[in-house]
């Protein structure tokens, strides 16, 4: 039975609705009666939407789809999906089923335009022709990445100290955050253009800078230069200082935290008063020492997406900022040790060795050692998945051939923490089950 | 209207230099890049560099870079190029272009009619 | 670099066919520009920031993009169209063109 269905993808944009197309040829006095039909996700082959004893048997699939049950008997078996997300991307495969049987996969390109870009300067005053200022690009929303690229004035390419970063939100749309360093000239226009290569849409966006003398005696803001570490649920403190001169008050203060990267507002304090948290209620100054300049930031609660950079702004008449480095971190648990086979082993045998260790933050190193602390590196594969929280779950996979008797280790380090948590297991010569019975 | 006058044809020897000019004229000169580009007799096109003639400065293709200089003189509203050391290699038609547009696309709008460079003993 | 591969090289077709050339890019490119060369003659700019006609190109010139590959179409030939067709980037240094398309009316 031939099935057809394009050759091309779908493209669907998130939120809309979209048609798999998919078709038979039915054979005269053919009815609904000896069909089935099966639409199924092609990797895993979970069940989406089926047809079957002369009956829809409805959508296994989020109550997202439906047939098109008056085209059937012409042999269009074709799905609609409604409300497309991100995670519908990937292939569906028709399966029909008459007398005989025929199948065919059809893909489903996902995609969303990305916003207009925003364009930010750091610093944004007191610009002057040889200050080095970072502009950032910000565009949102957007699937799948972007492209991005940036130019001058004059549509020359600017490459070199462009850093793009690009996150997905919890329903798989991008944020593209895109840096430049550039040293001003006498004055200058930079432009960023995303790019949605699916869609082949471009969002634009240019700033001008016309740099100029500044005045003088901006204020001396006061970061640590090194980053605070924090554990996560922990709080941290996010220490700014600036130096109050005589007779300052706190009506004559602005003080702002945000995010250095995308400028979303953290926590503010302006015309006398403490306007609050903008950032999850998560953070707190310390109102009783702010008088003596210390305009520090708690972070309460510290969660993996804090981590980051975060901008201390401080005006008074004049103005000053600096920017602190939060390095979120969360230690690895004692790794669990698994063989396999774990049954009747004996010299020569090859065994796979897991070392898993889990919910830790940033991601680990794992370094696997013999009994004679001789460096295990050939055969190891380590993967590290990250779960809603962020946090890492870490396995190390080592196939070995046994010897007459040996101990293997496995070591999973925090870089940040430096902290070390290991596990071994010690295979003997002799055949053996693992775990050892009682 | 927008044109850009390139200077006559050169015949050289192998080992000496020359140098072209490519005159503006019907815009505002310092406004936009000028560029020049290489190409050999049935052969395709070869981008040599280009000058900001408001700011000079200059970038080139690495291929081209220890042989060429590009300058520009405002004053007359006039690009010009020099090739140092000459081989057969450089015996080819040389345009120079105005790259045109307006944020973010730009492209080649006004070319010159060429300038010949023929090398020869 | 951008290599811009241009095929096919030599492209020979009658008046009134439709006719496709392609340019395709090493990696992703800002927008595509397109000129038009006739013996003895300079460049003209013949397509601009990937689909737009330059000042006098007539509407049966039209691009489509799919990846990193370009494909210039020219839906009814014309004498008039027989020249040399590159393409040309600049998303990053050097600007580079594409080695050409020839397209002979037979």
């Known amino acids: 039975l031939e099935v057809q269905v394009p050759e091309d993808p779908v493209v669907a944009l998130v939120g809309t609705d979209a048609t798999l197309c998919c078709s038979f040829s039915p054979e005269p006095g053919f009815s609904l009666a000896q069909l089935n039909l099966i639409w199924q996700l092609t990797d895993t082959k979970q069940l989406v939407h089926s047809f079957a004893e002369g009956q829809d048997q409805g959508s296994a699939y989020a109550n997202r789809t439906a047939l098109f049950p008056d085209l059937l008997a012409q042999g269009n078996a074709s799905l609609r999906l409604q409300r497309v997300r991100v995670a519908d991307e990937g292939s569906f495969t028709c399966f029909v089923s008459i007398r005989d049987f025929g199948s065919a996969a059809v893909s489903l390109q996902v995609a969303a335009p990305y916003s207009k870009p925003s364009m930010t300067l750091e610093p944004n005053k007191d610009l002057r022709p040889g200050d080095t200022v970072t502009i950032t690009c910000s565009s949102y929303q957007g699937y799948p990445e972007a492209e991005v690229f940036w130019q001058d004035g004059q549509g020359v390419p600017l490459t070199g100290n462009v850093t793009t970063s690009q996150m997905a939100n919890e329903q798989g749309l991008f944020d593209v955050h895109s840096i430049l360093r550039v040293v001003l000239g006498a004055n200058g226009t930079y432009s960023c253009l995303v790019r949605n290569p699916v869609l082949q849409q471009d969002a634009h966006s240019s700033v001008t800078i016309t740099p100029q003398r500044s005045p003088t005696g901006a204020v001396e803001v006061q970061v640590p230069e090194d980053p605070v570490v924090a554990l996560v649920g922990t709080d941290a403190t996010l220490r700014c200082s600036f130096s109050p001169e005589p007779g300052f008050s706190l009506a004559q203060l602005n003080l702002i935290w945000q995010l250095t990267d995308t400028k979303q507002l953290v926590h503010s304090f302006t015309e006398g008063r403490d306007q609050g948290s903008a950032y999850a209620n998560r953070t707190a100054l310390f109102p009783d020492l702010l008088a003596q300049g210390n305009a520090s930031l708690r972070l309460q609660r510290v969660r993996v997406a804090d981590e980051g950079s975060f901008t201390c702004f401080v005006s008074i008449r004049d103005f000053g900022s600096a920017a602190v480095s939060l390095q979120v971190a969360a230690p690895y648990s004692k790794p669990s040790m698994t063989l396999e086979p774990n049954k009747d082993l004996r010299p020569g045998d090859t065994v796979t060795i897991t070392c898993s260790s889990y919910r830790g933050y940033p991601e680990a190193e794992v370094f696997w050692q013999d009994g004679q602390g001789v460096p295990l590196t050939g055969n190891v594969t380590t993967s590290q998945m990250a779960n809603e929280q962020g946090l890492f779950d870490v396995h190390s996979v080592l196939r070995v051939v046994l010897g007459a008797n040996g101990t293997y280790s496995c070591l999973v380090r925090n870089p940040v923490l430096q902290q070390d948590a290991h596990g071994s297991v010690t295979i003997t010569g002799q055949p053996m089950t693992f775990p050892p019975e009682a | 209207q927008v044109q850009l006058q390139q200077s006559a044809a050169e015949l050289a020897r192998p080992g000496a230099s020359v140098k072209m000019s490519c005159k503006a004229s019907g815009y505002s000169f310092t406004s936009y890049t000028i560029h020049w580009v290489k190409q050999r007799p049935g052969q395709g096109l070869e981008w040599i560099g280009y000058?900001?003639?408001?700011?000079?400065?200059?970038d080139y293709n690495q291929k081209f870079k220890d042989e060429t200089t590009l300058t520009a003189d405002r004053s007359s509203s006039t690009a010009y190029m020099q090739l140092i050391s000459l081989t057969s290699e450089d015996s080819a038609v040389y345009y120079c272009a105005r790259y045109s547009g307006s944020t973010p696309y730009w492209y080649f709008d006004v070319w010159g009619a060429g300038t010949t460079v023929t090398v020869s003993s | 670099q951008i290599v811009l591969t241009q095929s096919p090289a030599i492209l020979s077709a009658s008046p009134g066919e439709k006719v496709t050339m392609t340019c395709r890019a090493s990696?992703?490119?800002?927008?595509m520009n397109w000129y038009q060369q006739k013996p003895g003659s300079s460049p003209k700019p013949w397509i601009y920031a990937t689909s737009n006609l330059a000042s006098g190109v007539p509407a049966r010139f039209s691009v489509s993009v799919s990846g990193t590959s370009h494909s210039l179409t020219i839906s009814r030939v014309e004498a008039e169209d027989a020249a040399t067709y590159y393409c040309?980037?600049?998303?990053?240094?050097?600007?580079?063109f594409g080695a050409g398309t020839k397209l002979e009316l037979k």
């Open positions: 990696s992703s490119v800002s927008y």
């Open positions: 000058i900001n003639p408001n700011s000079r400065n200059t």
């Open positions: 040309q980037q600049w998303s990053s240094n050097p600007l580079t």
